[in-house]
Interface confidence: low
């Protein structure tokens, strides 16, 4: 039993870290493997994560990690029974992947604009709440070449979109993802898409 691609881990820096790795052959991850993790502080407990299959040879482990501190380092050990396959460390604050923004909605707004709104995935008391910037992707459902990308670098999780910048009568989809600049994070996963019809004359129809 060998690890082909060693574990790559990311933290949402609030409650969960996820590690993913690839084995050298199809593996029943939950039956054959265990990932142990322990905070590198005295008195911390050793925890065990039971991995799940993402694909035939790809395993994923989701580890509940409460109250991450910037200096936290976790010792990770990947076991196949009594055999240690891999050992490494992981610092959640250095490998942040933000939670996915939620509840993306589109509303007609004044002056022939669409108002896109979504929810910040972090509670207000969380450090990442005020650190997130967003990318919004707007695409024409029937024309792959008709798409726009908007960077939202201000605090509010909203985007105003002039209806005139989109083709009239076309169906558009939007999705949003988040990034935490201070933590040099990766991008979050994309939110589920929301779709609307860009009719804007007369506006009263909306």
């Amino acid at each position: 039993v060998k690890v082909l691609h060693e574990p790559s881990c990311f933290s949402d820096y609030i409650s969960t870290s996820v590690c993913q790795w690839k084995m050298d052959h199809p593996t029943n991850c939950s039956a054959e493997l265990r990932l142990s993790y322990q905070l590198d502080f005295m008195g911390s407990e050793n925890h065990t994560c039971v991995p799940e299959n993402r694909e035939d040879s790809v395993c994923v482990c989701s580890m509940p990690i409460d109250d991450a501190v910037e200096a936290d380092v976790y010792q990770l050990d990947l076991w196949a029974g009594q055999q240690l396959l891999w050992s490494g460390s992981f610092q959640p604050s250095k490998h942040v992947k933000p939670r996915t923004p939620g509840n993306l909605t589109v509303h007609p707004n004044i002056s022939h604009t669409w108002l896109l709104m979504w929810t910040n995935p972090y509670p207000t008391e969380n450090h990442l709440h005020s650190e997130l910037t967003y990318m919004v992707n707007v695409s024409n459902d029937n024309d792959p070449e008709d798409f726009k990308v908007y960077n939202v670098t201000y605090m509010g999780p909203t985007l105003r979109l002039a209806a005139s910048t989109l083709k009239s009568g076309a169906s558009y989809s939007a999705r949003v993802r988040a990034w935490a600049q201070t933590y040099n994070s990766t991008w979050s996963d994309w939110s589920p898409s929301t779709t609307w019809l860009n009719y804007y004359e007369p506006w009263e129809q909306h």
Epitope: I14, S15, F41, M42, G43, E45, D66, V69, E125
Partner: antibody, heavy 119, light 107 residues
Framework: QIQLIQSGPELKKPGETVKISCKAS????????MSWVKQAPGKGLKWMGW????????TYADDFKGRFAFSLETSASTAYLQINNLKNEDTASYFC????????????WGQGTLVTVSA | DIVMTQSHKFMSTSVGDRVSITCKAS??????VAWYQQKPGQSPKLLIY???YRYTGVPDRFTGSGSGTDFTFTITSVQTEDLAVYYC?????????FGGGTKLEIK
Amino acid sequence: QIQLIQSGPELKKPGETVKISCKASGYTFTTFGMSWVKQAPGKGLKWMGWISTYSGVPTYADDFKGRFAFSLETSASTAYLQINNLKNEDTASYFCARHTFQSRGLAYWGQGTLVTVSA
Amino acid sequence: DIVMTQSHKFMSTSVGDRVSITCKASQDVITTVAWYQQKPGQSPKLLIYSASYRYTGVPDRFTGSGSGTDFTFTITSVQTEDLAVYYCQQHYSTPWTFGGGTKLEIK
């Protein structure tokens, strides 16, 4: 706003059991760990341990292993402290305290529950 | 267990004065120290976390410093409402431990 509301004062006899509740509101309960802290009358603060509201795993300080139990009712955003076989030295105020995110300071505290153990 | 020692049980000061409360850890706890204020009949309140960071809404007259084993909590200009007991606490390793507390009295 964020609140931790604890159950009311208790008067118990030695050998009895008490169960204190701590109801959280104003935030996602499973996001932050919950600690329990004891304060005997006129004395300082003593950390009893904590429970991960995400995984439900409790951690107890040595002095609080055995007769003390932390539990959760996640659907009700409530943490519990149960003390079995009460002793006179258990007379104290007990606080639940929610962890912070950035550090392991205790950011929000319940109002405290006074447990009096007397024959 | 890590022992947190606050050498002064009581400190007396006047309004407008600068006062510093010290806390010593029995071993290196890097910067994993918090400071709390407990007024009579109330729950403790977090003032400082990670040794030097003011918690949300805490007035800037409260400051914290230190690392390793020696930590200091300072009120730069004492107000009458600062009458309270102040506790340090380490969260470097479990069991998390508090200092014995320092009662600040206003002259």
